[in-house]
Interface confidence: low
């Protein structure tokens, strides 16, 4: 009869830039040798060759040199394919053809995903607001995939659906930047929240802006910064917003602007005597010179690192003087967890197994939850460790020890508390012998 080829029913979800394993297995008969095996991976729709094994040899990748087999496991029937540095363009169906004497095939779907950044909120106009004024609030979230769902609500949690325009634009990597614009008439004051949902990762990123329309007091320069921390992904650029209201006839020659670290008072960047004095912070900062005259004293911090996290103070002096501090919260998404099983074969009900859930290069420290196939939390016999690398990013390893029932599914959820990003992995264990760790 035909050879039975097994692949996961559910799509394999992979984060952009990470590696994905497309699982495929067959049951070799006694006396099977790799010389008999023909294995072909191809794109289901176009039939484009991806990787092959024939005549006892790995024929290599035909797909941008980003694929690999598991040569040591082929003889046990593991025909899985490793796809490295996943891109949006990789999304789709891959077919695994196995031929020995008989032949069989099965298709596995790859679903690509990327978490959306915490939304940034901008307001236009952003000063001298009065109840009854119409304002435009823009919510922007970047570099996610697939397209997001966007929800707006007011401070009472009532959904705002009228006067919302949402656009999503893919960049050259296929990742989407989402910009959602809400037009509202101000009441006495109001909070407006924007929630950007990644439907595949079931990741919600949200931000809110509170508008209190009233005239600023006279006297000291009023310096305005966001109340909420600015959240920036490691390696991206962050804007620490700071603004003041220039009076008529204001010129940049009058302006003294100093950015410094709030705690240590270390100088970060300055503008004095009518000139940008440049970065005093590892040459990674910049002002917006064309916008200074309009009162925009914001600071651009490039290639954000974990060590940048903390409070930055914006000092503005014209004739009067004012200052305000803005917090930078650094974050990095956790990778989709990989699941390993020990022991991983000849399992029987009553055996004690150790399931390890590993997720990499996130920040800050993760929260880890385990649950069984019925959704019941598993809290006993869990040991979680988190280790920071030299960049300050955490690798999390959570170990669950369980006694097997007849069969069972065990899920691990790694949550980034700042990005509100959940990364899930699960493993299903049946009472049958297994020859390699199942992938989530």
């Amino acid at each position: 009869g035909a050879l039975e080829v097994q692949v996961p029913e559910d799509p394999v979800v992979a984060l952009v830039g990470t590696d994905a394993t497309l699982c495929c297995s067959f049951s070799p008969e006694p006396g099977f040798s790799l010389a008999q095996l023909n294995l072909i991976w191809q794109l289901t729709d176009t039939k484009q060759l991806v990787h092959s094994f024939a005549e006892g040899q790995d024929q290599g990748s035909a797909y941008a040199n980003r694929t690999a087999l598991f040569p040591d496991l082929l003889a046990q029937g593991n025909a899985s394919l490793r796809l490295q540095r996943v891109r949006v363009a990789d999304e789709g169906s891959f077919t695994c053809f196995v031929s020995i004497r008989d032949f069989g095939s099965a298709a596995v779907s790859l679903q690509v995903a990327a978490p959306y950044s915490k939304p940034s909120m901008t307001l236009e106009p952003n000063k001298d607001l009065r109840p009854g004024d119409t304002v435009t609030i823009t919510c922007s979230s970047y570099q996610g995939y697939p397209e997001a769902e966007v929800f707006w609500q007011d401070g009472q949690g009532v959904p705002l659906t009228g006067n919302v325009t949402t656009s999503q634009m893919a960049n050259e990597q296929g990742l989407f930047d989402v910009h959602s614009i809400l037009r509202v008439v101000l009441g006495a004051n109001g909070t407006y929240s924007c929630l950007v949902r990644n439907p595949v990762l079931q990741q919600d990123a949200h931000s809110s802006v509170t508008i209190t329309p009233q005239r600023s007091p006279t006297g000291a320069v009023e310096v305005q910064v966001p109340e909420d921390p600015v959240v920036a992904l490691v390696g991206t650029d962050a804007t620490l917003r700071c603004s003041f209201s220039p009076e008529p006839g204001f010129s940049l020659a009058q302006l003294n602007l100093i950015w410094q670290l709030t705690d240590t008072k270390q100088l970060v960047h300055s503008f004095t005597e009518g000139r940008d004095q440049g970065s005093a912070y590892a040459n990674r900062t910049a002002l917006f010179p064309d916008l200074l005259a309009q009162g925009n004293a914001s600071l651009r911090l490039q290639r954000v690192r974990v060590a940048d996290e903390g409070s930055f103070t914006c000092f503005v002096s014209i004739r009067d003087f004012g200052s305000a501090a803005v917090s930078l919260q650094v974050a990095a998404p956790y990778s989709k967890p990989s699941m390993t099983l020990e022991p991983n074969k000849d399992l029987r009900p009553g055996d004690t197994v150790t399931i390890t859930c590993s997720s990499y290069r996130g920040y800050p420290e993760a929260e880890v939850f385990w649950q069984d196939g019925q959704g019941v939390p598993l809290t006993g016999n869990v040991t979680t460790s988190q280790m920071a690398n030299e960049q300050g990013l955490f690798d999390v390893h959570s170990v669950l020890r369980v006694v097997l029932g007849a069969n069972g599914t065990y899920s691990c959820l790694v949550r980034n508390p700042v990005l509100q990003q959940d990364a899930h992995g699960s493993v299903t264990i049946t009472g049958q012998p297994m020859t390699f760790p199942p992938e989530a």
Partner: antibody, heavy 119, light 113 residues
Framework: EVQLVESGGGLVKPGGSLKLSCAVS????????MSWVRQTPEKRLEWVAS???????FYSDSLKGRFTISRDNSGNILYLQMSSLRSEDTAMYFC?????????????WGAGTTVTVSS | DIVMTQAPLSLPVSLGDQASISCRSS???????????LHWYLQKPGQSPKLLIY???NRFSGVPDRFSGSGSGTDFTLKISRVEAEDLGVYFC??????????FGGGTKLEIK
């Protein structure tokens, strides 16, 4: 043991207000989405509102801003503030726990508290 | 909003018989992530609802294996293979694919013939 215990129901006149509470024990409250669901005298179930573990709130459109869901993670209490009450708000109000994932099924329910709106 | 329609309204059965309850949605409940968020609850007389089945066919913790869920798209079925006295009550289906709002069916009352 996982427990949800609602309180605060009672008889109120149309236009009045009421605040329901749901005291939670036996699990990490701050890790779960929570919801209010009501059952009408005709025994129909109606979803009222939900609040995620991150504090994002969702409401039934028909409530038009009259109800507010909130949570106190330190005190393990879920609230539902109801104002401008109408006769059609008469129901048994249940608090319910969402799954720890975002699948939005309700795996634990309280016994309910009765709200009667009548003049 | 998604409308959930259950049939029959009332289902008289004899103990030991098989029972089957239908639930139909006004739109497909297949989410863009491939999952189908259709759930079943049982409310016994004088009690609050209890989760039986989540995501079409997954039995919740402690639910006997005589309960099974099936279906796809817009048509779903809850089957009880051998009805026992403790199974009597009102069964509700619900969907959480298209939320908000979370919507429930009108209920099916399982009673003794």
């Amino acid at each position: 043991e996982v427990q949800l215990v609602e309180s605060g129901g009672g008889l109120v006149k149309p236009g009045g207000s009421l605040k329901l509470s749901c005291a939670v024990s036996g699990f990490t409250f701050s890790s779960y989405a929570m919801s209010w669901v009501r059952q009408t005298p005709e025994k129909r179930l109606e979803w009222v509102a939900s609040i995620t573990d991150g504090g994002i709130t969702f409401y039934s459109d028909s409530l038009k801003g009259r109800f507010t869901i909130s949570r106190d993670n330190s005190g393990n209490i879920l609230y539902l503030q109801m104002s401008s009450l109408r006769s059609e708000d008469t129901a048994m109000y249940f608090c319910a726990r969402g799954s720890i994932t975002t699948d939005w099924y309700f795996d634990v329910w309280g016994a309910g508290t009765t709200v009667t709106v009548s003049s | 909003d998604i409308v959930m329609t259950q049939a029959p309204l009332s289902l008289p059965v004899s103990l030991g018989d098989q029972a089957s309850i239908s639930c139909r949605s006004s739109q497909s409940l297949v989410h863009s992530n491939g999952n189908t968020y259709l759930h079943w609850y049982l409310q016994k007389p004088g009690q609050s609802p209890k989760l039986l089945i989540y995501k079409v066919s997954n039995r919740f913790s402690g639910v006997p294996d005589r309960f099974s869920g099936s279906g796809s798209g817009t048509d779903f079925t809850l089957k009880i293979s051998r009805v026992e006295a403790e199974d009597l009550g009102v069964y509700f289906c619900s969907q959480s694919t298209h939320v908000p709002p979370y919507t429930f069916g009108g209920g099916t009352k399982l009673e003794i013939k």
